[in-house]
């Protein structure tokens, strides 16, 4: 029986050009975490395996850094990074737990506020 739950940072936003930490935490289970996969809309970003450590997908290696912990740091954000991210926890003996994070990358806080608070 799977008793665990995944806690995530939920919906988050960050500025274009900046960085963000994607973080998930598995709780309420004594299952052993054997591997965590980080995915973005049917694309593999990175894997952290208990035995093998981290593997970053070649196409993301310049912009993705492992950690902190089992989390993932995205750097040099672009608006194309907006979307859903998934942390997939492979555990023994429970099986697989999945968490979801939605990231919105904003052009900039100045542009964001400028659109709403124009000086007459």
């Amino acid at each position: 029986m799977m008793t665990g739950t995944i806690e995530t940072t939920g919906n988050i936003s960050a500025e274009k050009g900046g960085s963000i930490i994607l973080q998930c935490h598995l709780s309420s289970t004594t299952a052993q975490v054997t591997q965590v996969n980080w995915e973005q809309q049917d694309q593999l970003l990175a894997i952290c395996n208990a035995d093998l450590g981290w593997h970053i997908s070649p196409s993301f290696k310049d912009r993705v850094a492992p950690g902190p912990g089992l989390g993932l740091t995205l750097q040099s954000l672009t608006v194309n990074d907006t979307g859903e991210y998934f942390c997939i926890y492979h555990t023994y003996p429970d099986g697989t737990y999945t968490g979801r994070i939605f990231l919105e990358v904003l052009e900039s806080s100045v542009a964001e506020h400028g659109a709403r608070f124009q000086i007459p």
């Epitope: 395996n49 093998l52 023994y92």
Partner: antibody, heavy 118, light 107 residues
Framework: EVQLLESGGGLVQPGGSLRLSCAAS????????MHWVRQAPGKGLEWVAA????????SYADSVKGRFTISRDNSKNTLYLQMNSLRAEDTAVYYC???????????WGQGTLVTVSS | DIQMTQSPSSLSASVGDRVTITCRAS??????LNWYQQKPGKAPKLLIY???SLQSGVPSRFSGSGSGTDFTLTISSLQPEDFATYYC?????????FGGGTKVEIK
């Protein structure tokens, strides 16, 4: 350098048994899942069986379930495939493969030929 | 079981040609798709993993794309050493399954 070396193949009669071995070197064997894949003469690739890094779990193709057993000895850096009740359709080259992160087969052995015939 | 359908089953091409091989899964497999090259009498060799990641040491003329059910292996400029059989393989769920293979022959 990663190396996988299969052995134990040969000619066996239908209903007979064989045990294949795959000797691993050049990497930390105990950290990797390992798989067996076979290829009948002139045919494509067929996955046979898999075992995780600590031998805690294994899985099999339906075509070999109940007849083949995958195992490993991490102290000897060796993977095994015990094949019982062999049939003519088991005739193939058997490859062992290393599977990092459970997703892709990055290194393969050279294969060992199993021929089941009377 | 997830069925993997490769097309074409064979093709003839010339050195320098752009070659495209497709693989279709019977259900969505996300990015869990790998491509292998096999030459006669030799073991398969990993080319592309996780749909689009180039395996270390593999020439950049090989590329992979796709997700879900439809995937493509592209060789941008075919070289003499690329004449071989290519297989796709899903690792989304067991039993792992391979496509039937695509034999790339010299025209």
């Amino acid at each position: 350098e990663v190396q996988l070396l299969e052995s134990g193949g040969g000619l066996v009669q239908p209903g007979g048994s064989l045990r294949l071995s795959c000797a691993a070197s050049g990497f930390t064997f105990s950290s990797y899942s390992m798989h067996w894949v076979r290829q009948a003469p002139g045919k494509g690739l067929e996955w046979v069986a898999a075992i995780n890094s600590n031998a805690g779990s294994s899985s099999y193709a339906d075509s070999v379930k109940g007849r083949f057993t995958i195992s490993r000895d991490n102290s000897k850096n060796t993977l095994y495939l015990q094949m019982n009740s062999l049939r003519a359709e088991d005739t193939a080259v058997y490859y062992c493969a290393r599977v990092p992160y459970g997703v892709w087969m990055d290194y393969w052995g050279q294969g060992t030929l199993v021929t089941v015939s009377s | 079981d997830i069925q993997m359908t490769q097309s074409p089953s064979s093709l003839s091409a010339s050195v320098g040609d752009r070659v495209t091989i497709t693989c279709r899964a019977s259900q969505s497999i996300s990015y869990y798709l790998n491509w292998y090259q096999q030459k006669p009498g030799k073991a398969p060799k990993l080319l592309i993993y996780a749909a689009s990641s180039l395996q270390s040491g593999v020439p950049s003329r090989f590329s992979g794309s796709g997700s879900g059910t439809d995937f493509t292996l592209t060789i941008s400029s075919l070289q003499p050493e690329d004449f071989a059989t290519y297989y796709c393989q899903q690792s989304y769920s067991t039993p792992l399954t391979f496509g039937g293979g695509t034999k790339v022959e010299i025209k």
